[in-house]
Amino acid sequence: SPYSSDTTPCCFAYIARPLPRAHIKEYFYTSGKCSNPAVVFVTRKNRQVCANPEKKWVREYINSLEMS
């Protein structure tokens, strides 16, 4: 199963467009057990948004969050 042992949630789609950077408060990676690698951005309204870690804007946001 793409959720492997069902011990971790996974992303099955990525957001198509960049979120406004100001809306994001934190991020985390989904488990390596998932079939699709993903970064999950958590917005200030606590929505968990799946993003493609290969996208330039995603990497830039991660760097920005790490520095803040």
Partner: nanobody, 124 residues
Framework: EVQLVESGGGLVQAGDSLRLSCATS????????MGWFRQAPGKEREFVAT????????FYADSVKGRFTISRDNAKNMVYLQMNSLKPEDTALYYC?????????????????WGQGTQVTVSS
């Protein structure tokens, strides 16, 4: 926005089974991930299970894992929650909810459309 209508709740004995159904209409159903949540009296709404747009991916709360199964029929615009080996602590109002498929689905904040709920009461 999606319109969601739950059914299938009721009063059962501990150990029994129930199958909840959620009929959907409105926004294109196949664009959405779906989930079930529940709220017991005096408690916060809690995540139960979620399923991806295609139905390939599912994830469950630890408290229901191995007992509950979420599924969907995209041809009928339906989502289901099969609940087996019910316990008194499963007593709650059960809600069906829809989310953009690019959200993770484990938080109520991931969802933007909610049904009115169906009551499940498990007696000991």
């Amino acid at each position: 926005e999606v319109q969601l209508v739950e059914s299938g709740g009721g009063l059962v004995q501990a150990g029994d089974s129930l199958r909840l159904s959620c009929a959907t209409s409105g926004r294109t159903f196949t664009m959405d991930g779906m989930g079930w949540f529940r709220q017991a009296p005096g408690k916060e709404r809690e995540f139960v299970a979620t399923i991806s747009r295609s139905g390939v991916g599912t994830f469950y709360a630890d408290s229901v894992k191995g007992r509950f199964t979420i599924s969907r029929d995209n041809a009928k615009n339906m989502v289901y929650l099969q609940m087996n080996s019910l316990k008194p602590e499963d007593t709650a109002l059960y809600y069906c909810a829809a989310r953009p498929d690019y959200t993770l689905g484990t938080s109520s904040y991931d969802y933007d459309s909610w049904g009115q709920g169906t009551q499940v009461t498990v007696s000991s």
